[in-house]
């Protein structure tokens, strides 16, 4: 009877991108007092683990520890909660969480086409490239949960490249990119060197647009 209870949440600590041989803890938690949590992996090998839930402060949780990350442990994980000893009466599944092993292949290069400081409002494109024939590039921004991904373009000047259009700059951040091959989507390269993108300039909405009369001027808003 799947889905009797609402889905729990699944988190990875310290994060879902895990270096080879390093430790990651997958935490399944809910405000429903589940007695057990089941962790299911789709990947190179399907597998299900079961742990007794810990209860405190109105939350039930279980920590599944992967002590040494290897390629066969990478994949898509979901967790379920169970309120009885019967393994068949479980909650709806958590949202899927992709656990990726990183650091397997040579690092790509990441560059900003506009230089180290970007004007607020200007369109930013970050380029990830490598001499390795990666099929896919993944761009991560520090503090953001999800990466952007793009297929690598055809080989040009000895490199395979993907250009990530980020749109008009609003605030800066630190970016990294990774490469992967289509037959092993959970196995990524080493991280590129981090790229700090700084954004300068403040929107001034009180000023006229080029089509408006120019008498409508005022003091700028400072958004620092």
């Amino acid at each position: 009877h799947e889905g009797v209870h609402r889905k729990p949440s699944l988190l990875a600590h310290p994060g879902r991108l895990v270096k080879s041989e390093e430790t990651v803890i997958l935490q399944c938690w809910s405000d429903v007092m589940f007695e057990h949590f089941l962790l299911h992996r789709e990947g190179m090998f399907n597998d299900t683990l079961r742990l007794i839930g810990e209860h405190h402060d109105g939350v039930s949780k279980a920590n599944f520890s992967i002590s040494r990350m290897t390629q066969d442990l990478a994949g898509t994980y979901r967790c379920y909660g169970s309120v009885t000893h019967s393994p068949y009466q479980v909650s709806a599944p958590s949202d899927p969480l992709d656990i990726v092993i990183i650091g397997l292949y040579e690092k790509p290069s990441l560059s900003a086409q506009l230089g180290p400081t970007v004007l607020a409002g200007e369109n930013v494109t970050l380029s990830c490239s490598s001499r390795s024939s990666y099929d896919m590039y993944h761009l991560s921004r520090e503090g953001e949960a999800h990466e952007r991904r793009l297929p690598a373009g055809p080989k040009v000047n000895g490199t395979f490249q993907a250009d990530f259009p980020l749109g008009p700059a609003t605030h800066g951040g630190t970016y990294r990119c990774f490469g992967s091959f289509h037959d092993s989507p959970y196995e990524w390269s080493k991280s590129s060197d981090p790229l700090l993108v700084s954004v300068t300039g403040n929107p001034s909405n009180s000023w006229p647009s080029p089509t408006e009369p120019s008498s409508k001027t005022g003091n700028p808003r400072h958004l620092h």
Partner: antibody, heavy 124, light 113 residues
């Protein structure tokens, strides 16, 4: 070719507001690639970038911290010009003030076109 | 802010001789991502605004005579005039455009010996 023509009073009393205008010909203040800057030059401080205005779907500004609390740079699209206002001036603000264009052909922050300069004296 | 320091403050060179002006930045202005140095050189004659000579540390602006050349990388840069002409008498400034606020050197006054 692109030219910048400056105008404005050359003598300002301390504590008053310095106001200068820079008229653009051969380019547009609403250009989606250029930025429009004010730079000043004095014997004590040398060349000092003060700030800029630019348009990228909407108007933006960017000011040097040293003058941020006192400065306003505004575009005037109908006259294709931009202005500098510097409030609460002191004799330290006495300088030659230049308007300048920055074009992305050179990398952002390179000033390829300059106004003729206006010597503004702040009297106490 | 990035501080730009030029040396010498003034320089007297004979006509036809080589003039060398140095510029040092307080932090690197080389952007490793594109391997470009965000440094420009300007020439200013009395009563005139500065005129752009060189950008990307070594690329001459169109119309600038080829006796002017720029070199250097990271934090140390040089402007060289290979054979000084009378019209080169001016004050020369370096400027970083790596990050705002854009900052200039204090200037080097070049005279004829």
């Amino acid at each position: 070719q692109v030219q910048l023509q400056q105008s404005g009073p050359e003598l300002v009393r301390a504590s008053q507001t310095l106001s200068l205008t820079c008229a653009i010909s051969g380019d547009s203040v609403s250009s989606n690639s250029a930025t429009w800057n004010w730079i000043r030059q004095s014997p004590s401080r040398g060349l000092e970038w003060l700030g800029r205005t630019y348009y990228r779907s909407k108007w933006y500004n960017d000011y040097a911290v040293s003058v941020k609390s006192r400065i306003t740079i505004n575009p005037d699209t109908s006259k294709n010009q931009f202005s500098l206002q510097l409030n609460s001036v002191t004799p330290e603000d006495t300088a030659v003030y230049y308007c300048a264009r920055d074009s992305p052909s050179y990398g952002r922050g390179v000033f390829d076109i300059w106004g003729q300069g206006t010597l503004v004296t702040v009297s106490s | 802010d990035i501080v730009m320091t030029q040396s010498p403050d003034s320089l007297a060179v004979s006509l036809g001789e080589r003039a060398t002006i140095n510029c040092k930045s307080s932090q690197s202005v080389l952007y490793s991502s594109n391997n470009k140095n965000y440094l420009a050189w300007y020439q200013q004659k009395p009563g005139q605004p500065p005129k752009l000579l060189i950008y990307w540390a070594s690329t001459r602006e169109s119309g600038v005579p080829d006796r002017f050349s720029g070199s250097g990388s990271g934090t140390d840069f040089t402007l060289t005039i290979s054979s000084l002409q009378a019209e080169d008498v001016a004050v020369y400034y370096c400027q970083q455009y790596y990050s705002p606020p854009y900052t200039f050197g204090q200037g080097t006054k070049l005279e004829i010996k």
